[in-house]
Interface confidence: low
């Protein structure tokens, strides 16, 4: 059982109150984290509570304001970036969100040496992406899908690309599908370590089918939003990688980096770029059928000013049991010799572990091993490798930080975080300064989050950066639910679950059960993290038991569980939720006439299929922005797990796994279907088709749409959504308002 913030004695329990929905919607109990913005081995920047940008030196203990809140306010800046030579700061304002990561903004350059904004050759607006070179103060930016370079902020720009066109050619920024499903960034350009070269991707979306939807706004006629969006089996973007010498761009044009022959022979993706040195770069490519990935190390040829990618420097990663990698193919972390690297991939037992590759993947040396998984490599120094894993005490939903000494033989392993604040902190991430001289640990729970600063040599805690004292005080008179993380063993499958129990939980009583599900491939819902959210309120105030279950297809427990859903989405994820519900009923405290399920996105798909499973287990359920057919979702994501929707591949299962095919089965459940009309990700089309199928089957259901809202249903829609879902559940469970 996970103990939440300490309780006062029973005698005082009357003064304590349950969580309210208002608490949740107002974000009353949200927490803060502290991630230093490292600018050297021992210095970092941080934006203070009053919005000054402050530079901290760990070794001298000194701090000083490099940019005042007055300067920030003068241009309404919401973000900043210091040039590596510390001469200039860019200030970002007029933030305008586009998709999940992308946004446009206006940028101003402030000269720290004279305390004035740079005048002359100002940046155009709005800019799609802007960044400093890693050394000095060169600027690269993307404007109207073309890349520009400035040697100094006041210089005229040098235009690198000329073919950028809205919705057609994207230079230095990803198109929709690469942003969401492959790169997970707003940018597609990468400076070499010393700023000599700039690599960038060009995405050609000319032949991609376009998704069009209405944006109602408040004009007389709605606008139509058009996005090149490849759905499963459709034509994909064509990607090319170029590198330009930024020192002499006036005569060295962009040079294309060749694609490995075994990749170029059919449709393919570019998955990531990692600079090794100024004259060595590593590119990762992936076949459209995503079980073959190639890592290609390329070298600069001075004579021809081109990039050479010898076959001897191609490393192939192939999965025979599923797709390549986890959610994404892992990226390499190069060692100091600039040719060997560390990388996470499946070992012979099907667990993802760190391997050291010196010459070939076949000769890789396994660095970690066991029936657990290495999750992230944070930093490799001359003598240490820092990584995170879920090894400690065999809880897959934990994250601890480990250090392996690679400078000595045999390498020794030390858990840096396992015993620091064992009850409070079981789920960590880390942020390292240059050469790992210092690092910050950010603990997300299960107790109240805390951020601390540590010495990279001794691991000694130097100071607390953020401990959320105000939150701790605010929670003192709140009756929080109890949480437990346990596992069920069913037919050789381990199902980890998190159960959220009402504050005065009594095993001899019967409680309504709400299953919250996501269940997408390589996801994890059962994590030892702190949260005060909607389901906390439902347990605290409304007396519900809430359960989250990680079934087949979920991550960090080995390939057997992960790849079980390969080419069969919508089968085992649903089965495992149902199996878990049956086990929960057997525990004796669940009212089996009051069981509901809800989920969002992939979770909306799973909850819909669970409701339509014909088991009679669920009284009601909610699907928010669900996928309803895999033919409607993005190619990159869908085909990774499902293959192609063609007769000679996997069309049959594409057809069998739709929500619409099960319309009849919704007759005996109460179903609430919710979707935003401007969802760029899971298109409103998905819910429109469910609704049409239910109408055609003459099945009654409830629905709510959110006009002009995207996949996140943000702002006032959030309040309306959770209020609406609360009413629906309380009605379903016969709870008084």
């Amino acid at each position: 059982i996970v103990l939440r913030p300490s309780r006062v004695h029973n005698s005082e329990e009357n003064t304590m109150r349950a969580l309210t929905l208002k608490d949740i919607l107002n974000g009353t109990f949200s927490y803060k984290t502290f991630f230093p913005n490292w600018i050297s081995g021992q210095e970092y920047l941080h934006q203070s509570a009053d919005n000054n940008i402050v530079l901290y030196n760990i070794e001298t203990g000194q701090s000083y304001t490099i940019l005042s809140n007055r300067t920030m306010k003068s241009v309404n800046a919401s973000n900043y970036g210091l040039s590596p030579d510390r001469q200039f700061v860019y200030l970002e304002s007029d933030y305008s969100k586009l998709w999940r990561y992308s946004y446009t903004a206006t940028y101003y350059i402030y000269d720290l040496s004279n305390g004035e904004f740079v005048r002359g050759n100002e940046l155009p607006r709005p800019i799609q992406y802007l960044c400093w070179s890693p050394v000095g103060s060169k600027l690269a930016y993307v404007y109207q899908n073309n890349i520009y370079l400035k040697q100094r902020p006041g210089d005229p720009p040098f235009q690198i690309t000329f073919n950028g066109r809205e919705n057609k050619i994207f230079n230095g920024i990803p198109d929709w599908v690469y942003e969401e499903e492959m790169l997970a960034t707003k940018y597609a350009l990468w400076w070499s370590p010393n700023g000599k070269f700039l690599a960038y991707a060009e995405f050609n979306d000319t032949d991609i089918p376009v998704i069009a939807y209405s944006y109602y706004g408040d004009e007389q006629y709605p606008r139509t939003i058009n996005i090149p969006y490849p759905k499963a089996g459709a034509k994909n973007p064509v990607v090319r990688i170029f590198i330009i010498d930024t020192t002499y761009p006036a005569y060295v044009g962009p040079q294309e980096v060749p694609v490995p022959a075994m990749i170029a022979s059919s449709d393919y993706y570019f998955s990531w770029l990692t600079w090794v040195t100024d004259e060595r770069v590593c590119l990762q490519w992936l076949k459209r059928v995503q079980n073959v990935s190639v890592l290609s190390i390329c070298d600069f040829r001075e004579d021809w000013q081109t990039w050479d990618c010898p076959k001897t420097q191609e490393h192939i990663e192939e999965s025979r049991t599923g797709w390549a990698g986890g959610f994404f193919v892992s990226t390499p972390v190069f060692s100091y010799d600039a040719i060997s690297y560390y990388k996470i991939f499946s070992d012979k037992d099907g667990y993802k572990h760190i391997h050291y590759i010196k010459d070939t993947v076949e000769n890789a040396i396994q660095i970690t091993s066991g029936k657990w998984e290495a999750i992230n490599i944070f930093r490799v120094t001359q003598d240490s490798l820092f990584y995170s894993s879920n090894e400690f005490e065999e809880y897959p939903g934990r994250r601890n930080i480990y250090r392996i000494s690679i400078g000595s033989y045999p390498p020794s392993k030390k858990c840096v975080t396992c015993h620091l604040r064992k009850e409070r902190c079981q789920y960590y991430t880390a942020s390292f300064s240059d050469y790992a001289k210092y690092y910050a640990l950010v603990c997300y729970g299960p107790g109240i989050p805390i951020s601390t600063l540590h010495d990279g040599r001794t691991d000694q805690e130097i100071k607390i950066l953020e401990e959320n004292k105000e939150l701790e005080n605010a929670l003192k008179n709140i009756q929080l639910p109890k949480e437990e993380i346990k596992k069920l063993e069913v037919d050789e499958i381990t199902l980890w679950y998190k159960m959220i129990l009402p504050p005065q939980f009594d095993r001899s009583k019967k409680y309504p059960l709400l299953i919250q599900v996501y269940g997408g491939p390589c996801s994890q819902s059962v994590r030892s993290v702190f949260a005060v959210n909607w389901i906390s309120y439902l347990a605290s105030k409304e007396g519900m038991v809430i359960a989250l279950v990680d079934g087949r297809g979920t991550a960090f427990q080995g390939d057997k569980l992960l790849y079980a859903v390969y080419r069969k989405l919508g089968v085992y994820e649903v089965e495992d939720q149902i199996t878990a519900v049956r086990k929960f009923i057997e525990m004796g405290f669940i009212d089996e006439k009051r069981i509901a399920i809800w989920g969002w996105s992939y979770g909306g798909y799973v909850s819909s299929l669970a409701l339509a499973s014909g088991t009679g287990l669920f009284k009601c359920g909610i699907a928010v922005a669900p996928v309803s057919s895999w033919e409607y979702y993005a190619s990159v994501y869908t085909e990774r797990f499902m293959g192609l929707p063609t007769k000679d591949d996997n069309l049959e299962h594409y057809k069998n796994s739709t929500v619409m095919a099960r319309a009849e089965y919704f007759r005996n459940v109460d179903y609430l279907l919710i979707h935003g009309t401007a969802d760029d990700n899971v298109h409103f089309q998905n819910s429109a088709q469910i609704a049409k199928a239910l109408v055609n089957a003459q099945v009654d259901f409830q629905a709510m749409w959110y006009s002009d809202q995207n996949h996140g249903l943000s702002g006032l829609s959030t309040n309306h959504l959770y209020t609406h879902m609360t009413h629906f559940l309380k009605q379903c469970f016969s709870l008084s308002d």
Partner: antibody, heavy 117, light 107 residues
């Protein structure tokens, strides 16, 4: 305004060598690449190779590799063709690379080289 | 090497005519295409880069279009000084290559 001024016309015998110069007047090549392009009578333009004075390493088209030598200092580039044959009779141009090395924005007036047997 | 093919090889036109010259690349060259004009006995002169961008000082009656493999140079109203040979050139992949030229002569 940069101008590229080339050396005068040459008549050479079969098997001889010729060296053509290209001088930047009113400035230096200042970081730009200098390409050499030839045009046989009534034929298309043919790129022979280039040199970036800052890098100093020439690049040659495959068909000219081994027979052509391109050199440069800050304001003059030279192109030498050895083992001349009658098919080398052509006008030889030097040209400056613009923002892309092979995009040629300023050209010399051309040097006619006639190879006679 | 990338082959560049122009058509027609020559054309006759009168002053004031609209003239279109096409250029095809043997593989995708994106927009990395230049057009040059060469008057008889003179050196080539850069008209256009990036397939569509006129060089400073080039009259607006010249325009370019296309990307990928197919490109066009259009002169909307032919003037006497426009009678010359026109070459397209790709500067996308080394070595740069030229089309065989299109001679525009007076009808």
């Amino acid at each position: 305004q940069v101008q590229l001024v080339q050396s005068g016309a040459e008549v050479k015998k079969d098997g001889a060598s010729v060296k053509v110069s290209c001088k930047a007047t009113g400035g230096t090549f200042s970081g730009h690449a200098i390409s050499w392009v030839r045009q046989a009578p009534g034929q298309r333009l043919e790129w022979m190779g280039e040199i970036s004075p800052m890098f100093g390493t020439p690049n040659y088209a495959q068909s000219f590799q081994g027979r052509v030598t391109i050199t440069a200092d800050e304001s003059t580039s030279y192109m030498e063709v050895s083992s001349l044959r009658s098919e080398d009779t052509a006008t030889y141009y030097c040209a400056r690379g613009a923002n892309y090395r092979a995009l040629l924005d300023y050209w010399g007036q051309g040097t006619l080289v006639t190879v006679s047997s | 090497d990338i082959q560049m093919t122009q058509s027609p090889s020559s054309l006759s036109a009168s002053t004031g005519d609209r003239v279109t010259i096409t250029c095809r690349a043997s593989q995708d060259i994106s927009s990395y295409l230049a057009w040059y004009q060469q008057a008889p006995g003179k050196a080539p002169h850069l008209l256009m880069s990036g397939a569509t961008t006129l060089q400073t000082g080039v009259p607006s009656r010249f325009s370019g279009s296309g990307s990928g493999t197919d490109f066009t140079l259009t002169i909307t109203s032919l003037q006497s000084e426009d009678f010359a040979t026109y070459y397209c050139q790709q500067y996308y992949i080394y070595p740069p290559t030229f089309g065989q030229g299109t001679r525009v002569e007076i009808k």
